[in-house]
Every structure is written in C-alpha cells, then in structure tokens.
C-alpha cells in the first residue's frame, strides 16, 4: 500500500486513520525536505489532486479538511513544490478508512451437518462495517466450565472432536473492529439437538398414465438418523405460492411421494428434512422440475434437469446413488 513509501516528512489524520463514516476529518501534511522551503503543499486522494479546503498552517505544514467523508477507503499522499525542483517532491502517504462499529451479533446458530464432523456456527453480523471486523466465537462447556475461543472473519467450523466437555455448551460471539466491540446473547446448545440429517435429494419423477394421472416423486437421503420429518414443497412454475406438505419418513428405502397434479403443467419440487422434533431444518434441496404430460406417461430424472422437455417420450433413467429398492415410504 501507500504506507510503504519513503517519506520526507509526515502525514497524519485527525481524529484517526480509521474513523466513523460520515465524520468531518482533517489530514495534515508536514514537510521535512532538505534544502526546501515549500512554496506550496499539495494533497492527492487516490491519485487525484485536491483543490479545495486546503489551509496552510505554517511554512512546513498544511491541512486538508473533508466534510462528511463517506468513502470506505482512500489513499492519501501529499507533495511539496520546492523552489529549485522542476517536479513536486513526495512528502508522505497514508491509507485511510471509514466505516462503522459492529452491530451486536444476533441470530447465533450452531448446527452439526450429519457426517461433516464439524459444528458450524453462524450469526447475523448486522450492517456492513466497511472495515476489517473480527469475530471471536466463545464455546463454554456447561459441564466442565472450560471455554474455548475461535477467531474468524465470518462463520466458524469447529471440529466436533474438539468438543470434549460433554454435550451442553454456551456459545456467544464477540465482534470487534477499530471503532468498537459488541457481544451477542448466549446461545445454549445440546449437541444431540443440533444435528441436521444428510441432505435429501429428489432423484426422479414419473407420471403414471391412468384415468387420473398420478405423479410419483422419488427421493432419498443417506441419513442414519431414525426419526426424520421432511417437507416437500411444489408449485407450478407459473405460480408464486408453494404447496408445502409434510412427510413422515423412513430412509431405509427410497421414498415415493404421490401427487394428483394438473396435466400439461411444468412443476418444480424441493424437499428438506429435520430430525423429528428438533429445531433446525436442512436447506431446501435444489429445484427439481417435472412437466406433467397431456396423456403420455413421463419420467424425469436428475439427468434431465434442464429446461427442455421430452414430451411424448417415456424417459426412464435413474441417478447413481439411488439404486436401493423403491418401496413406498409414505402412507395416507
């Protein structure tokens, strides 16, 4: 950065090099150039010469004043016009930053994605600070009182192997930057209550031709959790509103969910699951499209998840990883 240049003088900022966005600031430049009584002192911001709000304080020093400074970052340097020099002489430079103190972190959430081996903690950091802001995640065992701290600039993954103090913990987050520090409320967690099952995936769909065509959605998860509740949501692609349906699930076999849908309509489906009775859900699975036929039965699989439709064809394919037996997973 500009701070690495060799200086022939001194540049400083009041109130500070990092300051609150919108403040009035003063930048001072003091020349210390051998055999030079500066005729004039110039200020540059991001390489562009400033023409206004410059005050000469004494023979060697000048001040540049900014009202309501709103730029997150700027490189400042100043130069002197020396009587016997053809070019301006560089005095010194400084990078300045403006921003905000951190908000109180809220919505602290810690989950363990099944098979990940990590506890992932996230939070709402609040408004953008524009300046370097660090977060310290505190994890305190309620059984041993031992506390661990993790430094990060966003979220944190904590190895579950490092959580040796039993099952119950307090988690809180401290946010700090040059302008201030804030601390979240404490979140109490039990490791068994924050596990999110392995992602549920829709593998294929087919519409069976009958008096009333029936669409079957095939979906699965590699979870080993016994009691899992899932939601499937679907809508016609032309609609805004989702239909959300709940399924009691047993992932010892591929799930088959049956729907009576309108003919000749393109639908989109998504699924998500949680350990039954627990707090946290998986994110919704990726969008799965299926167009119901007018009359001809149709199969749609992961291999055909583009915006093209093989109308009139019976497409029968299966995604790898979904080769278990297709028993019906839902009743009623």
């Amino acid at each position: 950065g500009i701070t690495n240049i060799n200086c022939s003088g001194h540049i400083w900022v009041e109130p500070a090099t990092i300051f609150k966005m919108g403040m009035n600031i003063s930048i001072y430049c003091q020349a210390a150039i051998k055999n030079c009584q500066p005729r004039k002192l110039h200020f540059y911001k991001n390489g562009i010469k400033e023409r206004f709000q410059i005050t000469r304080i004494n023979k060697t020093t000048a001040r540049l004043w900014y009202k309501n400074f709103l730029e997150p970052h700027a490189s400042m340097y100043c130069t002197a016009e020396c009587p016997k020099h053809f070019q301006e002489t560089l005095i010194c430079g400084k990078d300045i930053s403006s921003g905000y103190p951190p908000d109180i972190p809220d919505e602290v959430t810690c989950v363990i994605y099944e098979y990940s081996g990590n506890m992932t903690c996230t939070w709402n950091a609040g408004k953008l600070t524009y300046i370097d802001t660090k977060y310290v995640v505190h994890v305190k065992s309620l059984e041993t009182e031992e506390e661990q701290q993790y430094l990060t600039s966003s979220y944190i993954n904590i190895s579950t192997d490092s959580l040796q103090g039993g099952k119950k913990y307090l988690v809180w987050v401290q946010a700090a930057n040059a302008l201030g520090m804030e601390e979240s409320k404490q979140l109490q967690i039990h490791l068994d209550d924050i596990v999110i099952p392995s992602a549920a995936v829709i593998s294929r769909a087919e519409t069976i031709n009958a008096t009333v065509p029936k669409t079957i959605i095939y979906w699965d998860s590699q979870t080993t959790i016994e009691k899992v509740s899932c939601e499937m949501r679907y809508k016609a692609t032309t609609n805004q509103t989702w239909n959300v349906k709940e399924f009691d699930t047993n992932f010892t076999y591929v799930q088959q969910s049956e729907f009576y849908l309108e003919p000749n309509i393109k639908y989109v489906f998504q699924v998500r699951c949680q350990e039954t009775g627990k707090r946290y859900w998986q994110p919704w699975s990726s969008l799965f499209f299926h167009k119901t036929p007018e009359t001809v039965p149709q199969v749609t699989s992961k291999a055909f998840q583009h915006d093209t439709w093989n109308s009139g064809l019976t497409v029968a394919s299966i995604s790898t990883g979904h080769l278990t037996s297709d028993n019906r997973g839902d009743i009623g």
Epitope: M232, E246, F259, Y260, R328, I331
Partner: nanobody
Amino acid sequence: EVQLVESGGGLMQAGDSLRLSCAASGRTSYIYTMAWFRQAPGKEREFVAAIRWSDTTTYYADSVKGRFTASRDNAKNTMYLQMNSLKPMDTAVYYCAVKRDSSTYYRVRNYDYWGQGTQVTVSS
C-alpha cells in the same frame, strides 16, 4: 377445486351413536385421502380418521380407535364417520378434509380442501 359439505351432527347423550357424512363435489378424481378432523372450543384441530380413496385403507386416532369407523361410497363421492359409544370428550366441530397427495395423513396442514364443519355435542 373440491367442495366438501358435512352433515349429520347433533346433540347426543353419552353412549349414543351418530353417523356423519361428507359429500365431495368438483374435482373428486383428485382425492388421494379424505379425512375427519375435529376442533373443541379453545383447542387445536386434531386428526380423527382418514381413508385412502384408492384402496379404502383407513387410519384412526388412538382416542377413537374401536369406537369410530370411516367408510366411503365411491359412487356418491361421500365419506362417512360412524361414531359409536360417544363420550363428552367427543364434543367438537367435525371437519371433513381432502388432500391430493400421499403426505402424512394426520397433519392438518397437509390437507388442501376443507368443509365448513358440523357440530357434535355429547352430554353426560
């Protein structure tokens, strides 16, 4: 759309029997499951019984098992709830509901269409 109209409710004595009917009209070919729910004053709506339309498989809440029987008349697009050995705790508004898919039968939120309800009051 499926329209549902319940009938047969009334004021009964404990131990009596009563038959509720639910007549469906409109897109009845889209019925996957038809169910009865009930709601007592100040309480949440709860599952009572359901019948899967395609194969007449029936499901019951534990509180009514052995006393209530769900059946259907396919030709009339009508579902019935035969209620025997009525108890004061059976007092509620009984609602008929339909869903178009194989989602969990006892969840209120899974049902797409609802009737207006019929009042059943059982005095001791």
